[in-house]
């Protein structure tokens, strides 16, 4: 009887972006109170750990932790709730969570077109390449959630190119892209040095990010 | 560096069953897959199955699914590949092998003999 | 019988390139890496080329990995004595669930 219950949410703490024998904490959680969660992993092992659900406030969560990241880890991750003891009886999925291992393939180069500072208003393209043979690149700014990505494109200097047009420049902020292969989707290369867009001009048309605070003040907003 | 040492070599009889072990050092056991991989004498090598040890669930290849258990006890690094309803054509090295994507380390092999 | 298929033998001089191909389908080698093992007699295998053309560190450059399609291709130049070994490909398949492995090709140098 899969989707009894409303879906559980599943999240990654410090994130879904993991270097190579760092931490990460996997947690399922919902407002439903479920004795166990089964922590579902797609890939070429597709595996299924059961958790205990804890009670706090109102919550029922649990958490599965990762001391060491590796490639064998990395995947798309589901979270189902169960309120029996009985494994059939589950809530619907939590959205999928994909866990991305970083920094195994050599950095790709991250540049603005028009310079890191731009007006607002003004296009901004950031383009990401590398003389490896990415396939894909993953663009991904602070303080957001999800990636932007774009195939990767041969280009006639020997590099390997994606150019992201991000629109009119309203906010500032600092991206970092990613290269990744067609075969290896949750294995990324090592972050491009960040790069710091900042915005200048009349801050009237200047309009916060849906994940960044307003600024109080006249001034270009960065984020650092 | 990481090290796979395996059990030693086992004669064993047709419908019995032979349990090897694979005890891993010097690398995070419960991160990274242990598959088994047999070569029969003079043949190529064959996936039999494998197993994540932070996950605990086994993942068997069509060709020995209920005949063989794979387990990995985290407390001692160690993985285990039991084979049962031995017959003469399972008589083969029987090898360790970690990694998900690809088998960067092996053990050394264990050579599992089934006669009469 | 191997679902990954391998010529049995290949063979070369000192100093030659030689090339050993692997085919595969779609649901292996078509969307999975394809991995390179070398094998010497009664020994392990040992891992030469992962996701199709990366070399582990220790392993020389003379070793090349492509991928094309469905089929993959070990390469290896300047050939030397100590390359005589079997060699075998892999691939996971996702119909089968599960790894397959060519056949392996036995690799000859002439003296």
């Known amino acids: 009887h899969e989707g009894v219950h409303r879906k559980p949410s599943l999240l990654a703490h410090p994130g879904r972006l993991v270097k190579s024998e760092e931490t990460v904490i996997l947690q399922c959680w919902s407002d439903v109170m479920f004795e166990h969660f089964l922590l579902h992993r797609e890939g070429m092992f597709n595996d299924t750990l059961r958790l205990i659900g804890e009670h706090h406030d109102g919550v029922s969560k649990a958490n599965f932790s990762i001391s060491r990241m590796t490639q064998d880890l990395a995947g798309t991750y589901r979270c189902y709730g169960s309120v029996t003891h009985s494994p059939y009886q589950v809530s619907a999925p939590s959205d999928p969570l994909d866990i991305v291992i970083i920094g195994l393939y050599e950095k790709p180069s991250l540049s603005a077109q028009l310079g890191p500072t731009v007006l607002a208003g003004e296009n901004v393209t950031l383009s990401c390449s590398s003389r490896s043979s990415y396939d894909m690149y993953h663009l991904s700014r602070e303080g957001e959630a999800h990636e932007r990505r774009l195939p990767a494109g041969p280009k006639v200097n020997g590099t390997f190119q994606a150019d992201f047009p991000l629109g009119p420049a309203t906010h500032g902020g600092t991206y970092r892209c990613f290269g990744s292969f067609h075969d290896s989707p949750y294995e990324w290369s090592k972050s491009s040095d960040p790069l710091l867009v900042s915005v200048t001009g009349n801050p009237s048309n200047s309009w916060p990010s849906p994940t960044e605070p307003s600024s109080k003040t006249g001034n270009p907003r960065h984020l650092h | 560096e990481v090290q796979l040492v395996q059990s030693g070599a086992e004669v064993k009889k047709p419908g019995s069953s032979v349990k090897v072990s694979c005890k891993a050092s010097g690398g995070t056991f419960s991160s990274y897959a242990i598959s088994w991989v047999r070569q029969a004498p003079g043949q190529g090598l064959e996936w039999m199955g494998g197993i994540i040890p932070i996950f605990g669930t086994a993942n068997y290849a069509q060709k020995f699914q209920g005949r063989v258990t794979i387990t990995a006890d985290e407390s001692t690094s160690t993985a285990y590949m039991e084979l049962s309803s031995l017959r003469s054509e399972d008589t083969a090295v029987y090898y360790c092998?970690?990694?998900?994507?690809?088998?960067?380390?092996w053990g050394q092999g264990t050579l599992v003999t089934v006669s009469s | 019988q191997s679902v990954l298929t391998q010529p049995p033998s290949a063979s070369g001089t000192p100093g030659q390139r030689v090339t050993i191909s692997c085919s595969g389908s779609s649901s292996n080698i078509g969307t999975n890496t394809v991995n390179w093992y070398q094998q010497f007699p009664g020994t392990a295998p040992k891992l030469l080329i992962y996701?199709?053309?990366q070399r582990p560190s220790g392993v020389p450059d003379r070793f090349s990995g492509s991928k094309s399609g469905t089929s993959g291709s070990l390469a290896i130049s300047g050939l030397q004595s100590e390359d005589e070994a079997d060699y075998y490909c892999a691939a996971w398949d996702d119909s089968l669930q599960g790894w397959l492995f060519g056949g392996g090709t036995k690799l000859t140098v002439l003296a």
């Open positions: 996701s199709n053309n």
């Open positions: 092998a970690r990694g998900l994507r690809f088998f960067d380390y």
